[in-house]
Amino acid sequence: FGISGRHSITVTTVASAGNIGEDGILSCTFEPDIKLSDIVIQWLKEGVLGLVHEFKEGKDELSEQDEMFRGRTAVFADQVIVGNASLRLKNVQLTDAGTYKCYIITSKGKGNANLEYKTGAFSMPEVNVDYNASSETLRCEAPRWFPQPTVVWASQVDQGANFSEVSNTSFELNSENVTMKVVSVLYNVTINNTYSCMIENDIAKATGDIKVTESEIKRRSHLQLLNSKA
């Protein structure tokens, strides 16, 4: 039973990751209520004394918000009535990582669920042919990563080949002194082959593919968040 003898309600969260300096979403849904004024949403964080965010009686209640989240949080007010308690977190900081609790009180009861939020930096790699090099060379660049990722090259033709001896990877600290630019160069590239530059840390995995033929160059890239059901 919840407060005032009310039953517990189902609250569901999804583990997610935030990209430093960008906006993030902490996902939370609950059994909806028919009256917005009866819904209270509270977000709390381990290690933080005040609330991350509070929404009650149809509006934000900021008096108990912890100073580290001031001006950076919002719920989707028009979606609360249908059971969306997700939190928008602006300008994600490295220190935003941790355990959060989405706590809901409605006329039906109360419930809560924890959410693990990871923070870091991740970006799409772009693979290009380096025409300045003396031999056929590919250059894979990704502007923002943190923590420092691993970079692995692969090829469609030479599956299972280890390219560590013919590649060189460097990490250059960006101006904000947290994230880094990733540059990896692959030498001795053969034509009519598809090469993949795979960048991975504990938050995300990104792949940049390039297919080089005599007549054209085709590129493709994608990014996947790890340990996240999003």
Epitope: S63, K101, I105
Partner: antibody
Framework: QVQLVQSGAEVKKPGSSVKVSCKAS????????ITWVRQAPGQGLEWIGG????????KYAQKFQGRVTITADESTSTAYMELSSLRSEDTAVYYC?????????WGQGTLVTVSS | DIVMTQSPDSLAVSLGERATINCKSS????????????LAWYQQKPGQPPKLLIY???TRESGVPDRFSGSGSGTDFTLTISSLQAEDVAVYYC?????????FGQGTKVEIK
């Protein structure tokens, strides 16, 4: 309605410890921090620290660091403030309060007297 | 840490007259993110815990008589009792809740002249 009921007055010897309790009712205890504030006789209000009951996260004023421990028991909706190595200057009324910023609800206060 | 300073320390005012208490913070308590001043005023009577009167510098707590008003922004704030009543005899405190550690002013004792 929100209520914070504190334990009774205490008389303690210098060097000893005191543990004051604060039982909360009328709201969801795990949702809001509990703050502790003290007031020496004829003096102003002084923030000691606070706790987030759901995670057990506590923050203390620099002055009390190492001498104070604030805890919370979710099962009984009770917060505790323990102050050790007591000295005569610790004689004060100790208040618990709901919230960590704006304090709308206070306990009735617990007088702690430190005397040899 | 933010330090709060009140003036005067005590104040004697005739019944029905205006009482004005000032509060100064050592740094601004105005948040640029929401344009709110994180300042509250409390009233404390002997043997009782403090009672919240005003928050966000100028918003009256429900049930507080409208003779109590708060004003100011940034670092300088004022609590005004427009027409002092006998039951207003108390000590008044300002408090910043902009950041921890929470800080209170030293208090202003209001008496009847």
């Amino acid at each position: 309605q929100v209520q914070l009921v504190q334990s009774g007055a205490e008389v303690k010897k210098p060097g000893s410890s005191v543990k004051v309790s604060c039982k909360a009712s009328g709201y969801s205890f795990i949702s809001y921090a509990i703050t502790w504030v003290r007031q020496a006789p004829g003096q102003g209000l002084e923030w000691i620290g606070g706790i987030n009951p759901i995670f057990g996260t506590a923050k203390y004023a620099q002055k009390f660091q190492g001498r104070v421990t604030i805890t919370a028991d979710e099962s009984t909706s009770t917060a505790y403030m323990e102050l050790s190595s007591l000295r005569s200057e610790d004689t004060a009324v100790y208040y618990c309060a709901k919230g960590q910023a704006l304090i709308q609800h206070w306990g009735q206060g617990t007088l702690v007297t430190v005397s040899s | 840490d933010i330090v709060m300073t009140q003036s005067p320390d005590s104040l004697a005012v005739s019944l029905g007259e205006r009482a004005t208490i000032n509060c100064k913070s050592s740094q601004s308590v105005l948040s640029s993110s929401n344009n709110k001043n994180y300042l509250a005023w409390y009233q404390q009577k002997p043997g009782q815990p403090p009672k919240l009167l005003i928050y966000w510098a100028s918003t009256r707590e429900s049930g507080v008589p409208d003779r109590f008003s708060g004003s100011g922004s940034g670092t300088d704030f004022t609590l005004t009792i427009s027409s002092l009543q006998a039951e207003d005899v108390a000590v008044y405190y300002c408090q910043q809740y902009y950041s921890t550690p929470l800080a209170f002013g030293q208090g202003t004792k209001v008496e009847i002249k």
